[in-house]
């Protein structure tokens, strides 16, 4: 029997019946065996076919076989109900070999010309399968010349059989207190030849509960327990399963915080698998009872390990653990079923005893000594000599624990001394002056420190004076002996004050005229205001209307009198303001240098002389009565004048205070 070409020779060619295209002889038998390379098949088709027709092709025939399988037995010229002629059909080998057998019997009724066929090797597309047949590959099939290969979707790995995709389903660890896990692809069929391991690992103290949900379908066997595919559940205490079949397993209360779930599948079957919903429980903690005036959040039916609650107090109540305040409180349930900290109290906010108000007092409005939330107190200043600055003195104990004014201020009100009060009625006639009576000049300050000078009290801790009077002590403020509240210069009965700092106007030049002859002394303590010690007011913007030419001002001091000695008793003099041009002119003639009188000065005195301030009065205040407020204010500071006090045609020269209000305010606010 002739053999066809064998691989690796080119596999293609022609076959024909003996004698073709002539008629074939009787009693012929020919066999051709064609072999293609692995992964290839043989294709065969006929270009001519003319054989004797017989029932079931018993007489003459061409038989095509591939391995043990007969592909076709052919005869005749055209197919009938029981016989087949190739016509235009193409035949394919099942593997890489094809056997062709031609046979003719002992006779032919008429001449038949036989057949001619052509064959060739072609690649098998292993990826194409007939309907109903198992696919070549589990997931993806890739054909190539002479063969094919399989690959898998993400999350799978090719089994060593090179066709099955096993799920990569191990190593998943679930750490949440509840969750779901299922067989791969659920609810679609689970993969073959897979071994899945899932771990649930919760904190110690939790117990895992497993519920099988929806559906359960794992390949089973009627007699043997789960021989093919199975699900097992393992804890540190016991093993549950194996499970298979179609019945949902019962709830499993593992009493363990760690669970391992194993799912193993074989190479066959088509089942949807399983789904587990897991929860956890733990020993519950005692139900938290909110303290009075507080509430628990969140509210739960029960609280187990890791659950927590917070306490929130009503407005006006605060969290306290004993005496210690807390801004927030959260307790956490522990594995032994106890809370990690005890319940605090919600105590009513207590603002505590209010601070004492210097030069004032406090009154409990709500009730004696009541200092809790919403309690009201009233601050007031000592009448006559002090007045409350800014607020009305009413304070409420607010939820934040601070006494708070109606304007929202948490700081104490300020009792500011009332300024410009005097016992004196205007009228009456230092040089050429009169003795002051108690309370006439309560702002008068005696400054001793090398020389005798004066000043005027501002507020309760500042003294306004002349720069030239304290220039020598500017770097040694503590050397100044400051006395107030007395009329007699040498009296042992006075209020002593000491200087903390001396501020001399930066525009003042010592021994070069008296421009900017103004200074402030800061006292190291506040003085107590009374009828004999009261500050002078600073001039209002409108004050100039009370300081026009010929308006009367009052100067006071212990300076030289007509007798040429320092006064023992405080003296004062009422003197009119002098026209500025007139005063300037009076000091233009020698021995005074030109420009001695500046716009920062004002002059006062009589043209005829006799009434003046003198040496020892320096730094004292020239005061005026503001008839609108009925308070005295400082218009001038005793600065300089003629060598002979009270000289006719010469005037006392005073620092014009209204020009220095910004300077004074800046120093006082900064220091």
């Amino acid at each position: 029997t002739p053999l066809g070409p064998k691989w690796p020779e080119p596999v293609f060619g022609r076959l024909a019946s003996p004698g073709f295209p002539g008629e074939y002889a009787n009693d012929q038998e020919r066999r051709w065996t064609l072999t293609a390379p692995p992964g290839y098949r043989l294709r065969l088709y006929f270009t001519h076919f003319d054989l004797e027709l017989s029932h079931l092709c018993e007489y003459d025939f061409v038989k095509l076989s591939s391995g043990a399988k007969v592909l076709a037995t052919l005869c005749g010229q055209e197919s009938t109900d029981t016989e087949r002629a190739p016509g235009k059909d193409t035949f394919y080998s099942l593997g890489s070999s094809l056997d062709i057998t031609f046979r003719s019997d002992y006779s032919n009724e008429k001449p038949f010309t036989g057949f001619e066929a052509f064959y060739a090797a072609e690649d098998i597309d292993e990826c194409q399968v007939a309907p109903g047949e198992a696919p070549t590959c589990d997931h993806h099939c890739h054909n190539h010349l002479g063969g094919f290969y399989c690959s898998c979707r993400a999350g799978y790995v090719l089994h060593r059989n090179k066709r099955t995709c096993s799920a990569l389903c191990s190593g998943q660890v679930f750490t949440q207190r509840s969750g779901e896990l299922s067989s791969p692809e659920y609810p679609r069929p689970y993969p073959k030849l897979s071994s899945c391991t899932y771990s649930i690992s919760l904190e110690e103290g939790f117990s895992v509960i497993l519920d099988f949900v929806e559906s359960f379908d794992v390949e089973t066997h009627p007699e043997t327990l789960c021989p093919y595919d199975f699900l097992k559940i393992q804890t540190d205490r016991e093993e549950h399963g194996p499970f298979c079949g179609k019945t949902l397993p019962h709830r499993i209360e593992t009493k363990s915080n760690t669970v391992t779930i194993t799912f193993v599948t074989d190479e066959s079957g088509d089942h949807t698998g399983w789904k587990i919903h897991y929860t956890s429980t733990a020993q519950p903690c005692p139900y938290p009872m909110a303290p009075p005036n507080g509430h628990v959040s969140p509210v739960q039916a029960k609280y187990i390990l890791k659950d927590s609650f917070s306490i929130f107090c009503e407005t006006g109540y605060e969290l306290l653990q004993g005496h210690l305040p807390l801004k927030s409180f959260t307790a956490v349930c522990q594995k032994d079923g106890s809370w990690d900290r005890p319940m605090p109290a919600c105590s009513i906010v207590d603002c505590g005893p209010p601070d004492d108000l210097p030069s004032g007092r406090v009154e409990y409005i709500t009730g004696p000594g009541v200092t809790t939330y919403k309690a009201v107190i009233q601050y007031s200043c000592e009448e006559t000599f002090y007045t409350m600055k800014v607020n009305d003195g009413k304070y409420v104990c607010e939820a934040d624990g601070f006494w708070t004014s109606s304007k929202g201020e948490k700081s104490l009100p300020v009792c500011e001394p009332v300024c410009g009060l005097s016992a004196r009625t205007t009228g009456g006639r230092i040089y050429g002056g009169q003795k002051a009576k108690p309370g006439d000049f309560p702002w008068q300050v005696l400054i001793l420190g090398g020389t005798t000078a004066a000043g005027a009290l501002l507020y309760d801790n500042w003294v306004l004076t002349a720069a030239h009077a304290v220039y020598e002590q500017k770097h040694d403020a503590s050397a100044l002996d400051i006395r107030m509240g007395t009329l007699k210069r040498l009296s042992p009965h006075y209020t002593q004050a000491w200087s903390e700092a001396v501020f001399i106007h930066e525009g003042y030049t010592h021994d070069a005229g008296f421009d900017n002859d103004i200074a402030l002394i800061k006292l190291n303590n506040k003085v107590v205001i009374n009828s004999n010690i009261t500050p002078i007011c600073l001039p209002r913007k409108e004050a100039e209307s009370f300081m026009r030419t010929d308006d009367i001002g009052t100067a006071s001091g212990w300076g030289l009198t007509q007798r040429g000695f320092l006064a023992r008793n405080l003296m004062y003099v009422d003197i009119p303001i002098v026209d500025h041009q007139k005063c300037t002119a009076a000091y233009e003639k020698p021995p005074y240098p030109r420009g001695s009188v500046t716009a920062n000065m004002l002059c006062a005195g009589l043209e005829s002389g006799g009434k003046d301030s003198c040496r020892g009065d320096s730094g004292g205040a020239l005061v005026f009565l503001d008839s609108e407020t009925e308070r005295w204010f400082v218009g001038g500071i005793v600065s300089w004048g003629s060598m002979n006090c009270g000289e006719a045609g010469q005037y006392g020269v005073y620092t014009k205070v209204i020009n220095y209000i910004p300077w004074i305010e800046n120093i006082i606010s900064d220091f």
Partner: antibody, heavy 115, light 107 residues
Framework: DVQLQESGPGLVKPSQSLSLTCTVT?????????WNWIRQFPGNKLEWMGY???????SYNPSLKSRISITRDTSKNQFFLQLNSVTTEDTATYYC????????WGQGTSVTVSS | DIVMTQSQKFMSTSVGDRVSVTCKAS??????VAWYQQKPGQSPKALIY???YRYSGVPDRFTGSGSGTDFTLTISNVQSEDLAEYFC?????????FGSGTKLEIK
């Protein structure tokens, strides 16, 4: 990690004021809790002096109330102790601390009152 | 002021033993009591708060108990590093007050 650190002069003259600073790192003094000053005398006796709370409210030991002031600077996360008119009896190691809910103490600073 | 009395100034024990340090309040302080351990040259370190709650990181051989006026710190299985002075403290009311201390000596 929460840390408290005391600082201030180690020697103070009688009748003067003692001023100490506690610098807190790792936690804001306005977030929660009471921020305390505690002192330990020679012989180890401990005395609570007072606190300033997260809200700025103060509570003082009544035995010191006329002399003590506790303040804070929230921008620097510091709180301060001022004790006026000190005597030799105020010689001690001074600690700043959070008590109760969290427990953190400074390492302490030794203050001697002596002329 | 509430006085916290630690009647035993010194206590002697051996490694592995169990020892109880007591503290008595002069009036009811509920459970608002803390226990402190102070080793020489160190700041006090809190062990227990609210009478029986252990601070995190404190070994479980330290146990606190009591309420009202009588309080106990128990150290089971005493270790050599437990050599220290132990103070109780009440924070129930102003002023907060400390006990005078109990020194634990290891035999």
């Amino acid at each position: 990690d929460v840390q408290l650190q005391e600082s201030g002069p180690g020697l103070v003259k009688p009748s003067q004021s003692l001023s100490l600073t506690c610098t807190v790192t790792g936690y804001s003094i306005t977030s929660d809790y009471a921020w305390n000053w505690i002192r330990q005398f020679p012989g180890n006796k401990l005395e609570w002096m007072g606190y300033i709370s997260y809200s700025g409210r103060t509570s003082y030991n009544p035995s010191l109330k006329s002399r003590i002031s506790i303040t804070r600077d929230t921008s620097k996360n510091q709180f301060f102790l001022q004790l006026n008119s000190v005597t030799t009896e105020d010689t001690a190691t001074y600690y700043c601390a959070i008590l109760y809910a969290m427990d953190y103490w400074g390492q302490g600073t030794s203050v001697t009152v002596s002329s | 002021d509430i006085v916290m009395t630690q009647s035993q100034k010194f206590m002697s024990t051996s490694v592995g033993d169990r020892v109880s340090v007591t503290c008595k309040a002069s009036q009811n302080v509920d459970t608002n009591v803390a226990w402190y351990q102070q080793k020489p040259g160190q700041s006090p370190k809190a062990l227990i708060y609210s009478a029986s709650y252990r601070y995190s990181g404190v070994p479980d051989r330290f146990t606190g108990s009591g309420s009202g006026t009588d309080f106990t710190l128990t150290i089971s299985n005493v270790q050599s590093e437990d050599l220290a002075e132990y103070f109780c403290q009440q924070y129930n009311s102003n002023p907060l007050t400390f006990g005078s201390g109990t020194k634990l000596e290891i035999k």
